[in-house]
């Protein structure tokens, strides 16, 4: 039930996360299931446990097996299982199916290929990308953070893509590779200069002091899946995260919707316990894509309590 498949190549780093995650700070114990032997936590070991992570630095074929992780508390232990398989490196260029991560699809307008599992590792840019063992070269290919962007995707771009990066652990470097298939969708999409549907430009939003308020920034960017489109809020020209007011938060992640076939995004700004000083701020809804940036400004005003007359 709480089991997860993980795989890697011999002599590469492999990091596995416990499938039963607790909140941060809980004690996690790891065991090799076949022998019930505890995995050490000392980093001098080739295989060691580090909280919710199990690290093989580097991995060996003999490490294959089922590992048990137990997130511990005196009243409620939560057990998970990591089914780890380490394979010998192939001498030819073919990547067997059992080494492939999930397939991703792209189109002419959207061609991001994320490097699988990379978030578990301590790596630094840039990533190296390969297709059929050939290093990707040319201006059409751009390694950006943890993903590859292909400009002007064509059907010939379909295939198996391998990302390669270096994991650093206490000054020692270990290589990691991961491969996934990329398919190309024939999508007659297009991209527009952002159109903000809400809020209206210079809108005045009535709020009640002491209550919570939500502002939604909603914009459309064209038809079909969009590449590099975003909506966000700013306060007095500053990013929400940099503004430093914990009562005012952007909703995590952007909701994507398709309105009349258009690709739209919205971002909710939540203001908890509205205060007088919030009425003095300028709230900017920003929508941006490759065409440019559009901004709509909102200000808050105090909602007057309704007078009840008989």
């Amino acid at each position: 039930k709480f089991s997860k498949q993980s795989w890697g190549l011999e002599n590469e780093a492999l990091i596995v996360r416990c499938p039963r995650q607790g909140k941060p700070s809980y004690t996690v114990d790891w065991y090799y299931s076949q022998t019930n032997k505890s995995i050490p936590t000392q980093e001098r070991n080739r295989v060691f446990a580090s909280g919710q992570l199990l690290k093989f630095l580097p991995a060996a074929v003999a490490d294959s097996g089922i590992y048990t992780c137990i997130v511990r508390s005196p009243t409620f232990n939560r057990t998970g299982y990591a089914n780890v398989t380490i394979y010998k490196k192939q001498s030819d260029c073919n990547v067997p199916d059992y080494l492939m991560y999930s397939t991703v699809s792209g189109s002419e307008k959207n061609s991001k290929i994320y490097c699988p599992t990379i978030d578990l590792y301590n790596w630094t840019a840039p990533l190296e990308w390969f297709k059929n063992c050939q290093a990707l070269q040319g201006s059409r290919y751009r390694a950006h953070k943890s993903f590859l962007v292909i400009d002007n995707v064509m059907t010939e771009d379909a295939g198996d893509y391998t990302c390669k990066f270096i994991h650093n652990e206490n000054g020692a470097n270990y290589s990691v590779t991961a491969t996934r298939s990329f398919t190309v969708k024939d999508e007659q999409g297009f991209s527009l200069f952002p159109v903000i549907g809400a809020p209206a430009q210079n809108e005045i939003k009535e709020v009640e002091i002491g209550k919570n308020a939500n502002l939604t920034c909603s914009a459309c960017f064209g038809k079909g899946t969009q590449f590099l489109a975003a909506v966000l809020w700013q306060l007095n020209g500053t990013k929400i995260t940099d503004f430093g007011e914990p009562r005012i938060q952007q909703e995590e992640g952007q909701n994507q919707s398709f309105s009349n076939g258009l690709a739209c995004l919205d971002m909710v700004l939540r203001i908890a316990d509205v205060k007088e000083e919030d009425l003095l701020l300028q709230y900017d809804c920003l929508a941006l894509n490759l065409h440019g940036l559009r901004r709509h400004t909102v200000r808050l005003s105090r909602k007057n309590p309704i007078d009840h007359h008989s």
Epitope: K23, P74, F76, R78
Partner: antibody, heavy 117, light 111 residues
């Protein structure tokens, strides 16, 4: 988003059995976690009644154990509380909640149960 | 059962000031490097809301004005600076063993 909602009669006669149901939406109760009942007499503090884990194991507060049963209806994604032989001292707001490890991170809004003839 | 005793029973603090609530356990709730003490906030007519877990870890979405400390039998919840919206009852809860128990609560009023 996980949501919990208590339901059941608001008035129970002394010596009868109090029965409450908690309906969970947004998560299958047999997938993981523990599912609690907690009560709060008017103007007083919180008392943990017990919980049932996703595996079906139950843990009860010894002070109530002889009178308490917590069970699950998987088909409706509900869990229930039965408290027998009630007295006026059982009058309280009854909450259902979800426990992840040690803490209740999602709660219902609570339902007031009054024990009176 | 582990008995949790909170003090004070109530306190009044001005906005911008510091509020400190303590919780004392009848026996240690710490083991294996963790302290199994947690804090909740309850406003009138609402269910409790988790603030702090394992003595000092801030629950996701809770403002950094709230902090917890302590180990063994003595624990503290601190709110600094206090805001008007913090008026509520605060409860400690342990999970060192069954049964899980709560403190009797501390009422925080804003002057």
């Amino acid at each position: 988003q996980v949501q919990l909602q208590e339901s059941g009669p608001g008035l129970v006669k002394p010596s009868q059995t109090l029965s409450l149901t908690c309906t969970v939406s947004g998560y299958s109760i047999t997938s993981d976690y523990a599912w609690d009942w907690i009560r709060q007499p008017p103007g007083k503090g919180l008392e943990w009644i017990g919980y049932i884990r996703y595996s079906g194991d139950t843990y009860y507060n010894p002070s109530l154990k002889s009178r308490v049963t917590i069970s699950v209806d998987t088909s409706k994604n509900q869990f229930s509380l039965k408290l027998s032989s009630v007295t006026a001292a059982d009058t309280a707001v009854y909450y259902c909640a979800r426990t992840m490890m040690d803490t209740m991170d999602y709660w219902g809004q609570g339902t007031l149960v009054t024990v009176s003839s | 059962d582990i008995v949790l005793t909170q003090s004070p029973a109530s306190l009044a603090v001005s906005p911008g000031q510091r509020a400190t609530i303590t919780c004392r356990a009848s026996k240690s709730v710490s083991t294996s490097g963790n302290s199994y003490m947690h804090w909740y906030q309850q406003k009138p007519g609402q269910p409790p809301k988790l603030l702090i877990y394992l003595a000092s870890n801030l629950e996701s979405g809770v403002p950094a004005r709230f902090s917890g400390s302590g180990s063994g039998t003595d624990f503290t919840l601190t709110i600094n600076p206090v805001e008007a919206n913090d008026a509520a009852n605060y409860y400690c809860q342990h999970s060192r063993e069954f049964p899980l128990t709560f403190g009797q609560g501390t009422k925080l009023e804003i002057k």
